[in-house]
């Protein structure tokens, strides 16, 4: 294993005129650790403010975690010659707040990208597609990890965060080959209609620990390869017939529904019937009612139709506060 020589500057990496030169095939950037045998470069927890320009051409796995990158511009990893071997890129926890269009262009082998734990106030619609064409060249990405990328409220720039992420996922239909998508812990209240239809190859989808309140227009019908669907720790009250039928129609899927505030009233009857006969829900015996109060902590599988009633709504004049 080689690491940056002691004569290298200890300041965060800054591009210089020399960076226009092609990198030596085996050199290691300042503040990074490199292993040619493992095809791995780690520039971890070094407060880097830019992506090193002199990355070795052999790099297959690049860890740039725990830095202070702030902005990822177009062509942030574009090199001459290109980093043709780079397959896994981890940028988690690097204080990124802006990922611009074309940030990952000229990485022909990039299979896995992790942007988790960055407060992305701006994610360009063309971050993953690279161009604003209605149909872009397919992205090589197979795994895209976007857990906890929601910015604090004061950085949201008055736009829908759900919409911003969805736009990047569907732009140019570039991510049709994506197998894994993690979107956990992003405060999502909804998914824009048809976003999943643009990701037909998905095998693993993690939407856990969000605030999803309805799946009425989330269509899983096209996701015929889906194997794992994580919906734990959301705000789901009930799943309706259309959703139940779509999930049942997926040949390989396992669905995780724990820790949602299920409302056990008359609207829940179809879901309870479905739960009793389906094999797709993992840990279905753990699902319990949250509302109404009289049903709290009752196990959904143990309910029958007589338990699931809707109290008549009193006219306002008869209601008490």
């Amino acid at each position: 294993t080689s690491s940056a020589s002691s004569s290298s500057s200890s300041a965060p990496f800054l591009a210089s005129a020399a960076s226009a030169q092609p990198p030596l095939p085996d050199q290691c950037p300042a503040l990074c650790e490199c292993s040619e045998a493992a095809r791995t470069v780690k520039c971890v927890n070094r407060n880097l403010t830019e992506v090193p320009t002199d990355l070795p051409l052999y790099v297959r796995n690049l860890f740039l975690t725990g830095n202070q990158l702030a902005v990822l511009p177009a062509g942030a990893f574009a090199r001459r010659p290109p980093l043709a071997e780079l397959a896994a890129l981890n940028l988690s926890g690097s204080r990124l707040d802006e990922v611009r269009g074309g940030a990952f262009e000229h990485l022909p082998s990039l299979r896995q990208l992790d942007l988790s734990h960055n407060p992305l106030a701006y994610l360009s619609p063309f971050a993953f597609s690279g161009s604003n064409a209605s149909i872009s060249a397919p992205s090589p990405l197979v795994e895209l990890i976007l857990n906890h990328i929601v910015p604090p409220d004061d950085k949201r720039q008055n736009r829908s965060f759900e919409g911003m992420v969805a736009a990047a996922l569907v732009a140019g239909r570039a991510l049709q080959g994506l197998h894994l998508l993690e979107l956990a812990s992003n405060h999502f209240l909804y998914l824009p209609r048809d976003v999943l239809a643009q990701l037909p190859s998905l095998r693993y989808l993690d939407l856990s620990n969000n605030s999803l309140v309805s799946l009425t227009y989330v269509s899983f019908r096209n996701l015929t390869h889906l194997e794992s669907l994580h919906l734990e720790d959301n705000a789901l009250k009930v799943l309706h017939n259309g959703t139940l039928a779509e999930l049942q129609g997926l040949p390989h899927v396992r669905v995780f529904l724990d820790n949602n505030p299920w409302v056990c009233d008359c609207h829940m009857a179809d879901m309870v019937t479905w739960l009793k006969q389906t094999g797709v829900v993992q840990g279905k015996d753990r699902l319990t009612c949250a509302f109404p109060e009289k049903m709290r902590n009752r196990v959904l599988l143990e309910l029958n139709s007589a338990d699931l009633d809707c109290d008549p709504i009193l006219p306002p004049s008869l209601q008490t506060s």
Partner: antibody, heavy 118, light 107 residues
Framework: QVQLQQSGPELVKPGASVKISCKAS????????VNWVKQSHGKSLEWIGD????????NYNQKFKGKATLTVDMSSSTAYMELRSLTSEDSAVYYC???????????WGQGTSVTVSS | SIVLTQTPKFLLVSAGDRVPITCKAS??????VAWYQQKPGQSPKLLIY???NPYTGVPDRFTGSGYGTDFTFTITTVQAEDLAVYFC?????????FGGGTKLEMK
């Protein structure tokens, strides 16, 4: 910022057709459905239908099937609604609206007034 | 199609009032209800979606609640600029339908 710019007012004769445009800017056009809504003078809102700009797929209110045709031009990020066989009942303001949360419309055009009169 | 019955049609209010508007669906629409505000000569503006979630930038005096068939939209402290027509909309099944509207006017 997100904007939906609709074409100007139309005065047309009964039996004629009219095509209203809605040019979108400030967002990824193909990522969101475009809805069309009718508002007759002093009345409520009526949903005409929606179109998925990504593939041109449409969903119409049965009441407007045969009356309205929705199309998009992805290259110009523009949605269109054609109304045909117009009668005085079709006199109204027509809005295009971008969908945000499914079904809900978070940005609206300024409206296009269509007056059918001989 | 699902019918939404919105009441009342008109409301005379004073600044500072708490104003509830109700919307009743002819069948269950789960929590798939949106509320809009339309000021004279303007396009509608989305205030609430999924029954209770305020849209980005909407003042917190506008709130929504309900599930199934019965929904309430409330302005907790009416201000002069809130004078408008308010519409509910169900987005549960096509065709999406709107309530008849509630017009807010100052006493």
């Amino acid at each position: 910022q997100v904007q939906l710019q609709q074409s100007g007012p139309e005065l047309v004769k009964p039996g004629a057709s009219v095509k209203i445009s809605c040019k979108a800017s400030g967002y990824t056009f193909t990522a969101y459905y475009v809805n069309w809504v009718k508002q007759s003078h002093g009345k409520s809102l009526e949903w005409i239908g929606d179109i998925n700009p990504n593939n041109g797929g449409t969903n119409y209110n049965q009441k407007f099937k045969g009356k309205a045709t929705l199309t998009v031009d992805m290259s110009s990020s523009t949605a269109y609604m054609e109304l045909r066989s117009l009668t005085s009942e079709d006199s109204a303001v027509y809005y295009c609206a971008k969908e945000g949360p499914p079904g809900a419309m978070d940005y609206w055009g300024q409206g296009t007034s269509v007056t059918v009169s001989s | 199609s699902i019918v939404l019955t919105q009441t009342p049609k008109f409301l005379l209010v004073s600044a500072g009032d708490r104003v509830p508007i109700t919307c009743k669906a002819s069948q269950s629409v789960s929590n798939n209800v949106a509320w809009y505000q339309q000021k004279p000569g303007q396009s509608p503006k989305l205030l609430i979606y999924y029954a209770s979630n305020p849209y980005t930038g909407v003042p917190d005096r506008f709130t929504g609640s309900g599930y199934g068939t019965d929904f309430t939209f409330t302005i907790t402290t009416v201000q002069a600029e809130d004078l408008a027509v308010y519409f509910c909309q169900q987005v549960y099944s096509s065709p999406f339908t709107f309530g008849g509207g509630t017009k807010l006017e100052m006493k």
